[in-house]
Interface confidence: medium
């Protein structure tokens, strides 16, 4: 089942990336270097999707920058296939599933003076299920309320306050949001959740509710990158990968993150009996992508050099802000009760003892199905 997941894995986009750019991981590193001691959390598939959607209305070098930045080699597949691929993916992701909440969406808020091209609006709706809203940015408080209320409604109140402030000179604001909450295939026993120390640094220790469960997990020890990786399946197709770097090795692991590394992990997993200790946490990431994407070569679209003639006839239109917010909750709930009783762990004869894996220092996490839904670093649960 894990092998199937490897074969089906599309990293960051539904088209085979060219070797020039590893978009997902380059974006991760850009976010990490911008705020080294912060937690990071974003959805590569969701951001790729919104950029691909934007490329629908971009022309010449602006379009090329977006597609190359995404690492897409369009000799291998036509643009039409790219958009169709995302359309299919969106339909799959938005399908209601038991024990699986996923709200993913894109919206374009444009100044009242901007006339949108009908072809762009209909392509956005058809392919990306995206909405467009005329917005009075002169009333920045009202505009901000309009955007935040829209996202809160779409995510059933799970993502609120997407925007904290707003520039009244904005012309186009692109919003991309994703919320995920799913049930584990096997739940963690609530009785096993206890307050434990989490070492943010060797000097900074915080108390966190630590879930625990002994079970067979997909596990591997990556000696090259100095980390341990465990896969915890959700109900359905998704799996959470938790990566615990050895002490002092977080940067080494971050530098080694790549599509190849992820494929290797998924391929090399072995089923192992583990005593897994994992903090119960909710993590969110909110990013102004117009500040980060230029370092990945996607810059035109945010400047006066933007060619967005496919979006509007307005000659000087550019994307003022591109906001992405991703939220995930991790708790004990599962679709199947864990086999544990009130006694959490008992020691048996030496060799039968399962290995303890305690996520009590900063770690990385992926949530993958056939794509990387999320990628993050938990510095402080």
């Amino acid at each position: 089942e894990m092998k199937k997941r490897v074969e089906d894995l599309h990293v960051g986009a539904t088209v085979a990336p060219s070797s020039r750019r590893d978009f997902t991981f380059d974006l991760y590193r850009a976010l990490a270097s911008a705020a080294p001691s912060q937690s990071i959390f974003f959805s590569p598939v969701s951001i790729s999707m919104s950029l691909a959607m934007l490329s629908l209305g971009a022309g010449s070098s602006t379009k090329m920058q977006i597609l190359e930045g995404l690492g897409l080699n369009l000799q291998k597949s036509s643009e039409k296939e790219l958009h169709r691929g995302f359309q299919q993916l969106l339909q799959e992701l938005n399908q209601p599933r038991d024990g699986f909440q996923l709200s993913l969406g894109n919206a374009l808020f444009t100044d009242l003076v901007v006339d949108l091209q009908d072809t762009f609006v209909s392509a956005m709706k058809t392919l990306y299920l995206a909405d467009t809203f005329p917005t009075n940015f002169r009333d920045s408080a009202g505009a901000m309320k309009q955007i935040n209320d829209y996202v809160a409604k779409q995510t059933k109140g799970k993502i609120v306050d997407l925007l904290k402030n707003l520039d009244s000179n904005a012309v186009v604001i692109m919003v991309n949001y994703i919320f995920f909450k799913a049930k584990w295939e096997t739940s963690f026993n609530h009785k096993g959740t206890q307050e434990q120390d989490f070492y943010v640094t060797s000097e900074t220790v915080v108390r966190v509710p630590m879930m625990s469960r002994e079970d067979q997990y997909h596990y591997l020890l990556d000696r090259n990158l100095s980390c341990r990786v465990v896969g915890v399946p959700y109900q359905g197709n998704a799996t959470a990968l938790f990566i615990l770097p050895s002490e002092g090795k977080m940067q080494q692991v971050e530098n080694g993150l790549s599509e190849k590394t992820l494929r290797k992990w998924l391929k090399m997993f072995k089923k192992r009996q583990l005593e897994l200790y994992l903090p119960k946490f909710s993590i969110e990431g909110s990013y102004q992508l117009e500040k980060v994407l230029p370092s990945l070569g996607i810059s035109n679209v945010f400047t006066s050099h933007a060619d967005l003639s496919g979006i509007s006839n307005h000659s000087n239109i550019q994307v003022s802000e591109m906001v992405h917010k991703a939220v995930v909750e991790v708790d004990e709930s599962g679709t199947r009760a864990a086999a544990a009783t009130g006694t959490i762990f008992t020691f048996r004869s030496a060799r039968l003892n399962s290995q303890r894996l305690v996520f009590n220092r900063p770690f990385l996490m992926f949530i993958v199905d056939n794509n990387i839904l999320f990628l993050g670093k938990v510095n402080r649960p």
Partner: antibody, heavy 119, light 111 residues
Framework: QVQLQQSGAELVKPGASVKMSCKAF????????IEWMKQNHGKSLEWIGK????????NYNEKFKGKAKLTVEKSSSTVYLELSRLTSDDSAVYYC????????????WGQGTSVTVSS | DIVLTQSPASLAVSLGQRATISCKAS??????????LNWYQQKPGQPPKLLIY???NLESGTPARFSGSGSGTDFTLDIHPVEEEDAATYYC?????????FGGGTKLEIT
Amino acid sequence: QVQLQQSGAELVKPGASVKMSCKAFGYTFTTYPIEWMKQNHGKSLEWIGKFHPDNDDTNYNEKFKGKAKLTVEKSSSTVYLELSRLTSDDSAVYYCARGHDYDYGMDYWGQGTSVTVSS
Amino acid sequence: DIVLTQSPASLAVSLGQRATISCKASQSVDYDGDSYLNWYQQKPGQPPKLLIYGASNLESGTPARFSGSGSGTDFTLDIHPVEEEDAATYYCQQSNEDPPTFGGGTKLEIT
């Protein structure tokens, strides 16, 4: 209980090949790797390679690449070691063993297969 | 490859006394606080038998008179009190890095 059963002794001519087997009993075959060792008469042990039935992963000691080949028959929980282009240096006892869960050595061993290369 | 050097090559110990075997690695066999160093016992005509794994953990079935210690590059196997049935060759083995390697062996004779 856990047991690894190896095929019988072999007497082979130089230049020929030999294929020996290691059949696992008493545990879930796909959970643990099977490792192979060579022991020259009265000498220490050398690791040849390992096969992980869980994902068909094979690892070889650089020294034995081109000499040794590991294959599997999952239906019978059997791993095979084939040695090619045999010389007198290949005369030894070959052991298969079950690799431990977390890379902590090998916890169960076969009885060994003695290979003698002689014309 | 990591080279493991065992000493002494052979050892004669009286019944009831202590036998100490040393194993030195050419580089550390530790990973993330764990030592990937194992000890085996081999008797003539038999396969090796795992005694101790992870430097100091007794494999189930290993008598308590066997103990292992050490970390990094220096490891020791102790047998006390030595019994008649402990006459065998002892090997250390590292599993921290591929290829796994074995020490040259120490032959223990009981007098």
